[in-house]
């Protein structure tokens, strides 16, 4: 069948934009530490790199190859307010490369690394 | 309490990159659709913006306040290949402009849409 | 038990319009997606059109522009608007429910008979 360039081209970029990659999303301090309730950060949020997207096949998944580490500083207050904000330092990791692993490999990786 | 200007400055990068706007996010179409098993689609996934981030209290919401509608593009498959793909079209709404809202608020906007 | 019951197909001359409907009874939820497949004698079973709560609207391009795709959360009901109706519409319509994290997630209609003939 052939099918119309504008098509293609629109798909392709589909393509491109929807594959498995290091994408900026918004981490959520206090769940993701899973703090007391009467600890908040400001900002509340941090933006970092996990891997995203799309693969080609229901039995791969979207899984980083390689991370960085990266230190954000952030306030934290405590409720009630006995003292003002405190600047603390936290930790989190980056994806910095993705690759379409067969939920096999990920399997294997995930136990290399328990073994270490 | 006097602050270092980088820590000022690094955490109000991070208010910035983390605040409530669309974003460009991944939908798998064949789940989206809950097509039957054996129907699949070519990209799986399509590009769309969604309002996401976050809102400075958990009280607020972050929701979208303008819409534009598009359409784009994708090759269905059947499985057994008795014939080729099929072009298939596929609309839907991309958040243009969010807000962090009261969850009050949203209420009203849900329910004032139901009314029309 | 969910079940699905279409209604609306027949005999129809090309050109001519028809309004199939398809309604879930056994559910007191709404499902997330709905949409309808057609198999033409000898062929494959297809995918027509469908409709996500996310928004989401699809169209196979033989029939876009001349089939409407709605949906009534009240009464759990999918409804394709047929129009303009050619003989390769000629097939037998499916309309499906799917349910999400329910066990089976999708559900079938029984089918309903659309032929276009002069």
């Known amino acids: 069948a052939h099918y119309n360039t504008e098509i293609l081209k629109s798909i392709d970029n589909e393509w491109r934009k929807t594959q498995c990659m290091p994408r900026e999303v918004c981490i959520d301090v206090g769940k993701e530490f899973g703090v007391a309730t009467n600890t908040f950060f400001k900002p509340p949020c941090v933006s970092v790199y996990r891997c995203g997207g799309c693969c080609n096949s229901e039995g791969l998944q979207c899984m980083n190859t390689s991370t960085s580490y990266l230190s954000k500083t952030l306030f934290e207050i405590t409720v009630p307010l006995s003292q003002g904000p405190k600047p603390v330092t936290i930790s989190f990791a980056n994806h910095t490369s993705c690759r379409c692993m067969s939920k096999l490999d990920v399997y294997r990786q995930v136990h290399s690394i328990i073994r270490r | 309490a006097h602050y270092n200007t980088e820590i000022l400055k690094s955490i109000d990068n991070e208010w910035r990159k983390t605040q409530c706007m669309p974003r460009e996010v991944c939908i798998d179409v064949g789940k989206e659709f809950g097509v039957a098993t054996n129907t699949f689609f070519k990209p799986p996934c399509v590009s769309v913006y969604r309002c996401g981030g976050c809102c400075n209290s958990e009280g607020l919401q972050c929701m979208n306040t303008s819409t534009s509608y598009l359409s784009k593009t994708l090759f269905e498959i059947t499985v057994p290949l008795s014939q080729g793909p099929k072009p298939v079209t596929i609309s839907f709404a991309n958040h243009t402009s969010c807000r962090c809202m009261s969850k009050l608020d949203v209420y009203r906007q849900v329910h004032s849409i139901i009314r029309r | 038990e969910v079940q699905l019951v279409e209604s609306g197909g027949g005999l129809v001359q090309p050109g001519g319009s028809l309004r199939l409907s398809c309604a879930a009874s056994?559910?007191?939820?709404?499902?997330?997606?709905m949409g309808w497949y057609r198999q033409a004698p000898g062929k494959q079973r297809e995918l027509v059109s469908a409709t996500s709560e996310g928004g989401f609207t699809l169209y196979a391009d033989s029939v876009k522009g001349r089939f409407t795709i709605s949906r009534d959360n009240s009464k759990n009901t999918v409804y394709l608007q047929m129009n303009s109706l050619r003989a390769e519409d000629t097939a037998v319509y499916y309309c499906?429910?799917?349910?999400?994290?329910?066990?089976?997630?999708?559900?079938w209609g029984q089918g309903t008979q659309v032929t276009v003939s002069s």
């Open positions: 499906y429910m799917h349910w999400r994290g329910s066990d089976p997630e999708n559900y």
């Open positions: 056994g559910s007191s939820f709404s499902p997330y997606a």
